[in-house]
């Protein structure tokens, strides 16, 4: 923390301008009035302050707004945003997409994923839901940021907004996030024809249940291997060899390369070797012919 001193009369600050770059840290602390700083935040970003000087300005604002900055200040943080921690941002209430855009631009090229994730979270809370304008802003200014939201926050996405989400926006989404998004996507695209539906739903399929994957296998979709590998293990395991063959079409030839990787490896272990042999790929590890499979989990559940 900066030690407190009194401000020399000749150093008194009446407006935020470039002369402040010549102030030492303790002079800034003593001479800049926090209320003046807050009122003239729009000038700060145009002034080439050092990171040390920005620390002092942040300290001033923290003292003035211990419960969190108002949006009028947040909107004009500029490079001061780089000094914020997720804990600082968690105190904010942000509703303006202009504020979000401004801070996303500042954060570009800096390691600020935790801060950006928290900021987006505050915007969703502030706006009440993840509406189309917010999704459009995220996809335009922060590809992949959608996946920084928690499943709870993503649950506020209305199905009507799903169409604005591009495949690349979902690249970093985990299974729990796709579990939330998939049913919304299914609803959003339900009136589309088979092939058009598959193109749209494909990026969300990491959240699809077995019955939906089975249904796709009846529709001649020719799912590519990359999409198949992103399916939930639980959704793949119950599929039969015939269903996988129908689902993948010519892409089934790619199973050989993925033989040792989940979910293919786990799926192979659940298939009869005879059935696997029909794929013509030399896949090994299936249940030997003549073996009986007892599902002990059923008996345990009954006892």
């Amino acid at each position: 923390d900066v030690e407190r001193t009194t401000c020399p009369p000749e150093k008194e600050v009446h407006e935020i301008d470039e002369s402040l770059i010549f102030y030492k840290k303790r002079e800034l602390e003593a001479c800049v009035d926090a209320a003046l700083l807050a009122a003239q935040m729009d000038r700060v970003d145009a002034i080439p302050f050092t990171y040390e000087q920005l620390d002092v300005l942040k300290h001033k604002l923290d003292e003035l707004y211990p419960q969190g900055y108002p949006e009028s200040v947040i909107r004009h943080l500029g490079h001061l945003f780089l000094k914020m921690s997720p804990e600082d941002i968690r105190k904010w209430n942000v509703t303006s997409l202009e504020t979000l855009k401004a801070l996303l631009k500042v954060s570009k090229g800096h390691e600020m994923s935790a801060q950006v994730a928290t900021l987006i979270d505050r915007v969703v809370v502030g706006r009440g839901q993840l509406d189309k304008d917010t999704v459009d802003t995220l996809t335009a200014f922060c590809p992949g940021c959608l996946c920084s939201l928690s499943p709870e926050r993503l649950s506020s996405v209305p199905p009507s907004v799903i169409g604005a989400v591009r495949p690349q926006d979902l690249d970093t989404c985990g299974p729990r996030q796709l579990d939330v998004l998939y049913p919304k996507a299914r609803l959003a695209f339900q009136n589309m024809s088979g092939s058009e539906y598959f193109v749209k739903i494909r990026p969300f399929l990491g959240g699809a249940p077995t019955e939906d994957v089975k249904a796709l296998s009846q529709q001649n979709v020719s799912m590519d291997l990359a999409t198949f590998m992103k399916l939930r293990r639980e959704a793949v395991l119950p599929l039969t060899v015939a269903e996988v063959q129908k689902l993948l079409g010519p892409h089934v030839e790619g199973l050989k390369v993925e033989e040792q990787h989940s979910p293919v490896r786990d799926w192979i272990l659940k298939q009869r070797q005879d059935d696997l042999d029909t794929l013509g790929l030399g896949l090994q590890g299936g249940i030997p012919n003549g073996y009986l499979i007892l599902d002990l989990s059923v008996r345990e559940a009954l006892s």
């Epitope: 291997l225 892409h251 030839e253």
Partner: antibody
Amino acid sequence: EVQLVQSGAEVKKPGASVKVSCKASGYTFTNYWMHWVRQAPGQGLEWMGNINPSQGGPYYNERFRSRVTMTVDKSTSTAYMELSSLRSEDTAVYYCARPYYGSSYGYFDYWGQGTTVTVSS
Amino acid sequence: DIQMTQSPSSLSASVGDRVTITCKASQDINKYIAWYQHKPGKAPKLLIHYTSELQPGVPSRFSGSGSGRDYTFTISSLQPEDIATYYCLQYANPLRTFGGGTKVEIK
């Protein structure tokens, strides 16, 4: 040693059909799909399609779908490619090729010696 | 289907010259490209797979590079026995496609 030995050259009339064979040895026939590639005079290599040797399910290049039939005989480890309604543009060398599944869908590491098919009236 | 655009369609170079052939895919093929040498009356011969992996027994003057949609095949010092047509093959999709070929001749 892996070998793909193809049938001999054929001369056919327009409208006729030709059936080219490819006998595989030196590996487990049912562990690798068989592909067919052709090269017409002055043209490049063209992938025609492939077949699962275990249960005979083929996938064809759209360009040949209406005229090509790929089959296998597991008992003799032989793949066949039949092309019907032949025209002069089908004059080409036809190759069978076996993929190596090292990455993605596999590249071709073994080829037959080629079968020349001439279509002429 | 993925289209492969290969250039040039033919080239003439002197022995010892560096020769470069390019293939451009119609979409990202994630380095799943192989290069073949094809001589008249012979089956195509695999030289390189996965963009830059040299097949055993293939001379080190042959090399490959690239990523995304753009790929390059290079012969660092052309030899008389390198006279042939060279093809790229994409195998990022099960429906394989070849480039149009490049005929390499000696000046």
